[in-house]
């Protein structure tokens, strides 16, 4: 018999849901990385840009050995969802200027929404807590001036590429010990 | 204090060409995005144009569209707005505007711009 | 014929609560941010409302904004005389790649 009504189906493969995810993930990456260079091209940045509203980076080369499954779906998911925020926000806030770039960021929106949906269906399949974020959402204020948004999205792409490149390379070390 | 002053208003034929001029100061032109935006005598407002901080993203209205051109100097924190082919539907207040994002936070006094013959 | 809907007028007393409408559609209100302008006679326009529902420094806090869809409203409680004035609401609109306002409301303040 199968599972108890009302538990999480626990997948008979949890690898392929996982292979499934780093895919998506690896996808996701490519398309922050061209647009990133896009942005880079039509407004070109000053130096690195950083903004306060951004999670910091989860994993780092030191940390990738004592990774576990749990807390790296959960705080990915987490920083995902404040960078599908920004994007948002991105879209909706930022200007004429960006709304040249008006399709691939709804293209990219679209993706990381896609991605959490997937991480979210691997955490009820592997049976894990589906965490909320350890502080609500810190509504993101109105950009200074235009240069401002510019900035403030150089630096959401940035900050998205990075924590997609440590996402796959977490995934992928996770998979190998499953 | 953030001031904006437009001037090159007049009166002007139909057919005829007038360049508007917007001298901005107490902020930092460069890091705005700047808009023209003009109101018809007893009428609304009516959104003309755009240009982007660094003046390489321009947007315009349909009804002015191939005739108006926006542009800027940064050095001389000096925004423009060249009309050609003028009509007499073009009669209106213009009013400079700067924006941080889609909202206009200050205007200009605005210029009167009258086409007749 | 403007894009976004307004009434072209309002009134009320001295002290009343005023509410001011605007209706778009998904490209422009549903997807963008909604802005309010304040236009007293012989003057130009001056900024209200941005980001939906917020307020610049200066403004008074009997102003507020809202949105709900493809709508936004703009409320004037504790209505005084000096409000009497053209409103206007804003907001991109990504289909028409420009900014469009509502026609505007001539609001009266009665007695």
């Known amino acids: 018999p199968g599972p108890p009504a009302g538990s999480p189906r626990v997948s008979s493969d949890p690898r392929a849901d996982l292979d499934s995810a780093v895919l998506l993930t690896r996808s996701l990456l490519a398309d922050t990385r061209q647009l990133a260079a896009q942005m880079r091209d039509k407004f070109p940045a000053d130096g690195d840009h950083n903004l306060d509203s951004l999670p910091t980076l989860a994993m780092s080369a030191g940390t990738l050995g004592s990774l576990q499954l749990p807390g790296v779906l959960t705080r990915l998911r987490v920083d995902l969802m404040s960078y599908f925020r920004h994007v948002q926000w991105l879209r909706r806030a930022a200007g004429p200027s960006l709304k040249t770039l008006e399709p691939e960021l709804g293209a990219l929106q679209a993706r990381l929404e896609r991605l959490l949906r997937r991480l979210q269906l691997l955490m009820s399949r592997l049976a894990l807590p589906q965490a909320a974020p350890d502080q609500p959402a810190v509504p993101l204020g109105p950009p200074a001036s235009a240069w401002g948004s510019i900035r403030a999205a150089h630096a959401i792409l940035g900050g998205l590429h990075l924590t997609l490149d440590w996402a796959v390379r977490g995934l992928l070390l996770l998979k190998t010990r499953l | 204090q953030v001031q904006l002053v437009e001037s090159g208003g007049g009166v002007v034929q139909p057919g005829r060409s007038l360049r508007l001029s917007c001298a901005a100061s107490?902020?930092?032109?460069?890091?705005?995005?700047m808009h023209w935006v003009r109101q018809a005598p007893g009428k609304g407002l009516e959104w003309v144009a755009v240009?982007?901080?660094?003046?390489?993203?321009?947007f315009y209205a349909d009804s002015v569209k191939g005739r108006f051109t926006i542009s800027r100097d940064n050095s001389k924190n000096t925004l423009y707005l060249q009309m050609n082919s003028l009509r007499a539907e073009d009669t209106a207040v213009y009013y400079c505007?700067?924006?941080?994002?889609?909202?206009?936070?200050?205007w200009g006094q605005g210029t009167l711009v009258t086409v007749s013959s | 014929q403007s894009v976004l809907t307004q009434p072209p007028s309002a009134s009320g007393t001295p002290g009343q609560r005023v509410t001011i409408s605007c209706s778009g559609s998904?490209?422009?209100?549903?997807?963008?941010?909604v802005s309010w302008y304040q236009q007293l006679p012989g003057t130009a326009p001056k900024l209200l409302i941005y980001?939906?529902?917020l307020r610049p420094s200066g403004v008074p806090d009997r102003f507020s904004g809202s949105k709900s869809g493809t709508s936004a409203s703009l409320a004037i409680s504790g209505l005084r005389s000096e409000d009497e004035a053209d409103y206007y609401c804003?907001?991109?609109?990504?289909?028409?790649?420009?900014?469009?306002f509502g026609g505007g409301t001539k609001l009266t303040v009665l007695g």
């Open positions: 505007a700067r924006t941080p994002g889609f909202h206009f936070d200050y």
């Open positions: 107490g902020f930092t032109f460069s890091h705005y995005d």
């Open positions: 240009i982007s901080y660094h003046g390489s993203v321009k």
């Open positions: 998904s490209s422009n209100i549903g997807s963008n941010y």
């Open positions: 980001y939906d529902d």
């Open positions: 804003s907001a991109w609109d990504d289909s028409l790649s420009g900014v469009v």
